[in-house]
């Protein structure tokens, strides 16, 4: 069998809402993956599991099942959404994300994703992780790759 390539493209959109009383931020983050099947037979994308971390704390998880199949030598782009919650114990985040005098409220999040594919009863897992900028202050749609955090060092959070 040839490889199945998974490429995390980036954040596609982030939609923000707030709970004023709980000083909590809700971020629905939609990400884009490219999955390429380099084989001469179809493969199933059985599931995608994803989690989002801020400052080493997991703030959101998602799992998609029975997603799609990818034909021989084909590629599919898949969007998946991770609902995240930045809760009261990080209230300094609420202060920053709701600061109305500044326009962009970028925070650095670590996106982790694992894709499970199957073919002929065989299962394979491919994982990726990437730091991304996300604006926690307003609804934002990104051009693909626009939100990438380019610092190779782990950001100090």
């Amino acid at each position: 069998p040839r490889s199945i390539d998974v490429k995390y493209i980036g954040v596609k959109s982030a939609y923000v809402s707030y709970d004023v009383q709980k000083r909590t931020i809700y971020l629905n983050i939609t990400n884009t993956l490219n999955i390429t099947n380099n084989n001469y037979y179809s493969v199933e994308v059985e599931n995608i599991t994803a989690q989002v971390q801020f400052a080493k704390t997991v703030i959101g998880k998602a799992r998609l099942n029975n997603i799609t199949h990818i034909g021989p030598l084909d590629m599919k782009q898949i969007d998946y959404t991770v609902p995240t919650v930045i809760a009261e114990e990080m209230s300094y985040m609420y202060d920053f994300c709701t600061l109305i005098s500044i326009k962009v409220h970028n925070i650095v999040l670590m996106m982790q994703v694992t894709v499970t594919t199957t073919y002929f009863g065989h299962s394979e897992q491919i994982s990726q992780e990437r730091y991304q900028y996300v604006d926690c202050g307003r609804n934002t749609t990104y051009q693909l790759g626009q939100s990438e955090y380019l610092n190779v060092l782990q950001p100090q959070q």
């Epitope: 707030y18 004023v20 009383q21 000083r23 300094y92 985040m93 202060d95 920053f96 709701t98 600061l99 109305i100 005098s101 500044i102 326009k103 962009v104 409220h105 970028n106 925070i107």
Partner: antibody
């Protein structure tokens, strides 16, 4: 190093117009709001309005609507304030200002101000 | 517009004294997101204003801890615990919760 460089002093006739500039260095204005503030001689501060340079969206104090127009040119990283139909009441120092922040640090930056004198 | 009323207009103090400046807004300046965007600026002669305090009580970076802000709703206070010569100038409160944002009329802190 973040700086807001404002254009030089202006002496203008009543009824004329003037366009003030504020050129930013050290940051890209499209990612930040730019604000304008007026201060008449020996008087207090008045908030004129703000502009989002990325899309040109503006919010003005009602008092300045029609007579103060804010624009921006992201290619030159410059914000502009055009003042129309000037009267002696518009003799003032005009400041541009912005606020730049990340999660850990927010800074407030002001230009040195442009003095506008309206006199015949 | 939200009217910001500052008192007193002039505040003569001796160095080392405590100074207190009041600011009252004509309506609540609690933003819909729950935050109160009340700020205090100091302007020295011939200079642009400098931000001292934002969101009622948060001291801005580099501002000495002798400055403190308090208040809620419509009534706010700036206190300087021990006035130093470098503190002299005009203090302005500012509300950034409701457009158009507005400044108070200013309080001149001067030596007795």
């Amino acid at each position: 190093d973040v700086q807001l460089q404002q254009s030089g002093a202006e002496l203008v006739r009543p009824g004329a117009s003037v366009k003030l500039s504020c050129t930013a260095s050290g940051f890209n204005i499209k990612d930040y709001y730019m604000y304008w503030v007026k201060q008449r001689p020996e008087q207090g501060l008045e908030w004129i309005g703000r502009i989002d340079p990325e899309d040109g969206d503006t919010e003005n104090a009602p008092k300045f609507r029609g007579m103060a127009t804010m624009t921006a040119d992201t290619s030159s990283n410059t914000a502009y304030l055009q003042l129309n139909s000037l009267t002696s009441e518009d003799t003032a120092v005009y400041y541009c200002t912005t606020r730049i922040g990340n999660l850990y640090h927010v800074m407030d930056y002001w230009g040195h101000g442009t003095s506008v004198t309206v006199s015949s | 517009d939200v009217l910001m009323t500052q008192t007193p207009l002039s505040l003569p103090v001796s160095l080392g004294d405590q100074a207190s400046i009041s600011c009252r807004s004509s309506q609540s300046i609690v933003h819909s997101n729950g935050n109160t965007y009340l700020e205090w600026y100091l302007q020295k002669p011939g200079q642009a204003p400098k931000l001292l305090i934002d969101k009622v009580f948060n001291r801005f970076s580099g501002v000495p801890d002798r400055f403190s802000g308090s208040g809620s709703g419509t009534d706010f206070t700036l206190k300087i615990s021990r006035v130093e010569a470098e503190d002299l100038g005009v203090y302005y409160c500012f509300q950034g919760s409701h457009v158009p944002f507005t400044f108070g009329s200013g309080t001149k802190l001067e030596i007795k």
